[in-house]
């Protein structure tokens, strides 16, 4: 209810606009399976309105419910490739805080070479989103091959 | 009813409520890769408001940051048809005006018969989304398998 | 400026922010390919608020424009347990009542051990959403690998 | 701005090895990636080798175990050494670096007996 009466003085910012759309700047070193994104209208048709990038990854900024999408490509890829080198499998999850660590979404290429999802899921302010590719593989940087991108849906 | 009160202060356009879902209509000629969209209440469950069709094409009314979506089904196809076939590519982009033409999100079929993706883009008016399926294949006209849309997200 | 200063006369629930993310719950017995769904926060990072559960199948409260979305993993999958199975298909339509009854989406595994989509579609007041499973292969319960929603876009 | 030059390619027999140099005008440590492609005439430009700036690689299934590639980040060079050349490997060579460049001229590599 409090919402409801508060909601009446609210000007566009607060309707929590907040949304993302990234594209991917490297990979980390062997050892780490995080890929590193960067956003901003000098990089093309990536933004940032809202959330933040710390270190290469998306940090949220608003309570509320989010939709969150990726689509991911390998570079150098074929289909015997995919299943040469399986399994390499993204996964979407809170990295931090550690309290609230959790895998949100995951699949696998098996004889793919991109993998594309979305869903619906909560996330708090001070939320860190990490996208961790594991296996050999290396993602392509093309701008319409490999993006990660959240909408703010509601409190 | 309160829905309909309240909206009364605030005419619905101009939350740019501009959505859109198209169905397939027909693919071009021979040296033609562009697919050709319909829509409206007539044809089933696709609609267009806000979004125009241009000679099957789809053209944006109102600026702002849209979630594009889109899946294509091929229609005769198993993963050997798919691979041998291959490459077969979907690409979404701009077409038109030819200062803003770029691509906006691009998959291949591999060994699988279903392409389905979407993501978060800026959009102005007037610009005129191009899907394009490069290969010998044709996609199904079935229109659970076969559905391209977008949606206005923020100014 | 118009958008901020009407925005003071719209409360938050007639804006119909119904929305809804599932986790898989079982499947129907032999003869039955429908999924059963759960949600709600005791369970993890599902919900429902507005759209409700029958029978863990997802009932639509609101009338309007929804964003349909899924993803669905096989338990036990390699590309070769999803060829030799083949077809694994999975639908989403509108299964009661019988008058509106449609398939809205319609994915086939071929290859691959992960489907996902999502598509904009009018639904009603009432309308029930089935998501049939058809074949012998088991959805993963892991609600990062198979889960479903719904978002209300626009009136 | 980044120019890239290509050199080391030949006429090699069926089984005989080439290794390609392409130097860079600018820091390797620069770009994601630094790959080696190949163009048979009619046909797409291949992608078959990359080097991320951190050292990780990847091949296309037609040349693994074959061609090899690395860097001299002294000398802002990067290699590819092929060996076990078929007649398939036939095509022109460029190195290009992701985000892209300029094409090069290339490095024609021919296997034939």
């Known amino acids: 209810q409090r919402f409801a009466q508060a909601q009446q003085q609210l000007p566009l910012e607060s309707l929590g606009w907040d949304v993302a759309e990234l594209q991917l700047n490297h990979t980390g070193p062997q050892q780490d399976p995080r890929l590193y994104w960067q956003g901003g209208p000098a990089l093309g048709r990536s933004f940032l309105h809202g959330p933040e990038l710390d270190k290469g990854q998306l940090r949220i900024h608003r309570d509320g419910i989010y939709m969150v999408h990726i689509q991911v490509t390998l570079a150098i890829c074929s289909s015997t490739t995919a299943s040469r080198h399986h399994p390499t499998t993204l996964a979407v999850g809170i990295c931090s805080p550690a309290s609230r660590s959790i895998s949100l979404l995951r699949l696998s290429f098996h004889q793919g070479c991109t993998i594309a999802s979305q869903r619906l899921t909560p996330l708090a302010r001070g939320d860190t989103l990490c996208t961790n590719l594991t296996g050999t593989l290396l993602p392509s940087r093309n701008t319409d091959e490999t993006f990660f991108g959240v909408q703010w849906v509601r409190p | 009813q309160r829905f309909a009160q309240a909206q009364q202060q605030l005419p619905l356009e101009s939350l740019g409520w501009d959505v859109a879902e198209l169905q397939l209509n027909h693919t071009g000629p021979q040296q033609d890769p562009r697919l050709y969209w319909q829509g409206g209440p007539a044809l089933g469950r696709s609609f267009l408001h806000g979004p125009e069709l241009d000679k099957g094409q789809l053209r944006i009314h109102r600026d702002g940051i849209y979630m594009v979506h889109i899946q294509v089904t091929l229609a005769i196809c198993s993963s050997t048809t798919a691979s041998r076939h291959h490459p077969t590519t979907l690409a979404v982009g701009i077409c038109s005006p030819a200062s803003r033409s770029i691509s906006l999100l691009r998959l291949s079929f591999h060994q699988g018969c279903t392409i389905a993706s979407q993501r978060l883009t800026p959009l102005a008016r007037g610009d005129t989304l191009c899907t394009n399926l490069t290969g010998t294949l044709l996609p199904s006209r079935n229109t659970d398998e076969t559905f391209f849309g977008v949606q206005w997200v923020r100014p | 400026q118009r958008f901020a200063q009407a925005q003071q006369q719209l409360p938050l629930e007639s804006l119909g922010w119904d929305v809804a993310e599932l986790q898989l719950n079982h499947t129907g017995p032999q003869q039955d390919p429908r999924l059963y769904w759960q949600g709600g926060p005791a369970l993890g990072r599902s919900f429902l608020h507005g759209p409700e559960l029958d029978k863990g199948q997802l009932r639509i409260h609101r009338d309007g424009i929804y964003m349909v979305h899924i993803q669905v993993t096989l338990a036990i999958c390699s590309s070769t347990t999803a060829s030799r199975h083949h077809p694994t298909t999975l639908a989403v339509g509108i299964c009661s009542p019988a008058s509106r009854s449609i398939s809205l989406l319609r994915l086939s595994f071929h290859q691959g051990c992960t489907i996902a989509s999502q598509r904009l579609t009018p639904l009603a007041r009432g309308d029930t959403l089935c998501t049939n499973l058809t074949g012998t292969l088991l959805p993963s319960r892991n609600t990062d690998e198979t889960f479903f929603g719904v978002q209300w876009v626009r009136p | 701005q980044l120019q890239l030059v290509e050199s080391g390619g030949g006429l090699v027999q069926p089984g005989g090895s080439l290794r390609l140099s392409c130097a860079a005008s600018v820091s390797i440590f620069t770009f994601y990636f630094i790959g080696w492609y190949r163009q048979v005439p009619g046909k797409q430009r291949e992608l078959v080798a990359l080097i991320t700036s951190n050292g990780r690689t990847n091949y296309a299934d037609s040349v693994e175990g074959r061609f090899t590639i690395s860097t001299d980040t002294a000398r802002n060079t990067v290699f590819l050494e092929m060996k076990s050349l078929k007649p398939e490997d036939t095509a022109v060579y460029y190195c290009?670096?992701?985000?892209?460049?300029?094409w090069g001229q290339g490095a024609q590599v021919t296997v034939s007996s």
């Open positions: 290009n670096a992701d985000p892209s460049t300029d």
